[in-house]
Interface confidence: low
């Protein structure tokens, strides 16, 4: 397992609707065909996968029907877009990329984004 | 039920070949990558081949690099460990396992098969 | 290849005793470490991932903690069926390797 690089921003804070967006970007040591993005998340020192997707270079990302994550990606920079956060999924978000094909296998982990999620106030009632 | 039986094991010459098979049962096989774990009589564990769900990536160990081939025939739900030029050092039992869930390569072996034998000796 | 050291390699216990048994890794692997069961004569059954969360119908007495390179396995009060081998097993990156075992005999 060779390790590579990953950079991705510090914090970002989740829009009103739940949606938060960040970009990954790794250091590719090689011409790699097949590359896996994974999102991770840590809080209380404990490590979930939140959503992973394989794609092949000049393609798109393809999440799980269910998933809570899209993604484009362009070059060796995956923009990764989190929908659907309230409160509660504030954490640290982890990016681990990994190089899949051709070999050597190649492994990055970030050293996470902070996003920070607030709920939206209730509107009040309205006779609009 | 998860289920993955395991044939193909038996006595074999040094230099010799074997094909194992796996015959997985009890969830969508063509979603999940898998692999083969050996273990030497009395010895620990050592993984041994890894096969991505489509069949398009496949790894191994320095140890069995050049000589053992995994596939799968996901029609069939089935997974092989083709074995060539065997050794003396390849004598162990031989387990199918079942990575924990297709989203991810690189994870831990959820389920296993009950291993078959192979016996590499002259 | 990271290399995972089993420590200790046997250890002799009591019914209703605490267990720990660790697990060193050569070098970081966050937490990304497996704990599997062995009974003699049967296969592997998966009891950790992720360093620490349970895998789906393993007794609350198994419990997984650490990260990085130092990682333990702990039976809060054993069982008779728990007299096993155990393993460690990094999954961080590839090749995954495992520990060496650690033998869990009855005193």
């Known amino acids: 397992c060779k390790a590579m690089h990953v950079a991705q921003p510090a914090v970002v804070l989740a829009s009103s609707r739940g949606i938060a967006s960040f970009v990954c970007e790794y250091a590719s040591p090689g011409k790699a065909t097949e590359v896996r993005v994974t999102v991770l998340r840590q809080a209380d020192s404990q490590v979930t996968e939140v959503c992973a997707a394989t794609y092949m270079m000049g393609n798109e990302l393809t999440f799980l029907d269910d998933s809570i994550c899209t993604g484009t990606s362009s070059g060796n920079q995956v923009n990764l877009t989190i929908q659907g956060l309230r409160a509660m999924d504030t954490g640290l978000y982890i990016c681990k990329v990994e190089l899949m094909y051709p070999p050597p296998y190649y492994l990055g982990i970030g050293n996470g984004t902070q996003i920070y999620v607030i709920d939206p106030e209730p509107c009040p009632d309205s006779d609009f | 039920e998860v289920q993955l039986v395991e044939s193909g094991g038996g006595l074999v010459q040094p230099g010799g070949s074997l094909r194992l098979s796996c015959a997985a049962s009890?969830?969508?096989?063509?979603?999940?990558?898998m692999s083969w774990v050996r273990q030497a009589p009395g010895k620990g564990l050592e993984w041994v081949a890894t096969?991505?769900?489509?069949?398009?990536?496949?790894s191994y160990p320095d140890s069995v690099k050049g000589r053992f081939t995994i596939s799968r025939d996901n029609s069939k739900n089935t997974l092989y460990l083709q074995m060539n030029s065997l050794r003396a050092e390849d004598t162990a039992v031989y387990y199918c396992?079942?990575?924990?869930?297709?989203?991810?390569?690189?994870?831990?072996?959820?389920?296993w098969g009950q291993g078959t034998l192979v016996t590499v000796s002259a | 290849d990271i290399q995972m050291t089993q420590s200790p390699s046997s250890l002799s216990a009591s019914v209703g005793d605490r267990v720990t048994i660790t697990c060193r890794a050569g070098?970081?692997?966050?937490?990304?470490l497996a704990w599997y069961q062995q009974k003699q004569g049967k296969s592997p059954k998966l009891l950790v991932y992720?360093?620490?969360t349970l895998a789906e119908g393993v007794p609350s007495r198994f419990s997984g903690s650490g990260s990085g390179t130092q990682f333990t396995l702990t039976i809060s009060s054993l069982q008779p069926e728990d007299f096993a081998t155990y393993y460690c097993?990094?999954?961080?990156?590839?090749?995954?390797?495992f520990g060496g075992g650690t033998k869990l005999e009855i005193k």
């Open positions: 096969i991505s769900r489509g069949g398009g990536y496949t």
């Open positions: 396992a079942r990575e924990d869930y297709g989203s991810s390569y690189v994870h831990w072996f959820a389920y």
């Open positions: 070098e970081n692997i966050y937490s990304y």
């Open positions: 097993q990094h999954h961080y990156g590839s090749p995954r390797t």
């Open positions: 992720n360093a620490r």
């Open positions: 009890g969830f969508t096989f063509s979603s999940y990558t």
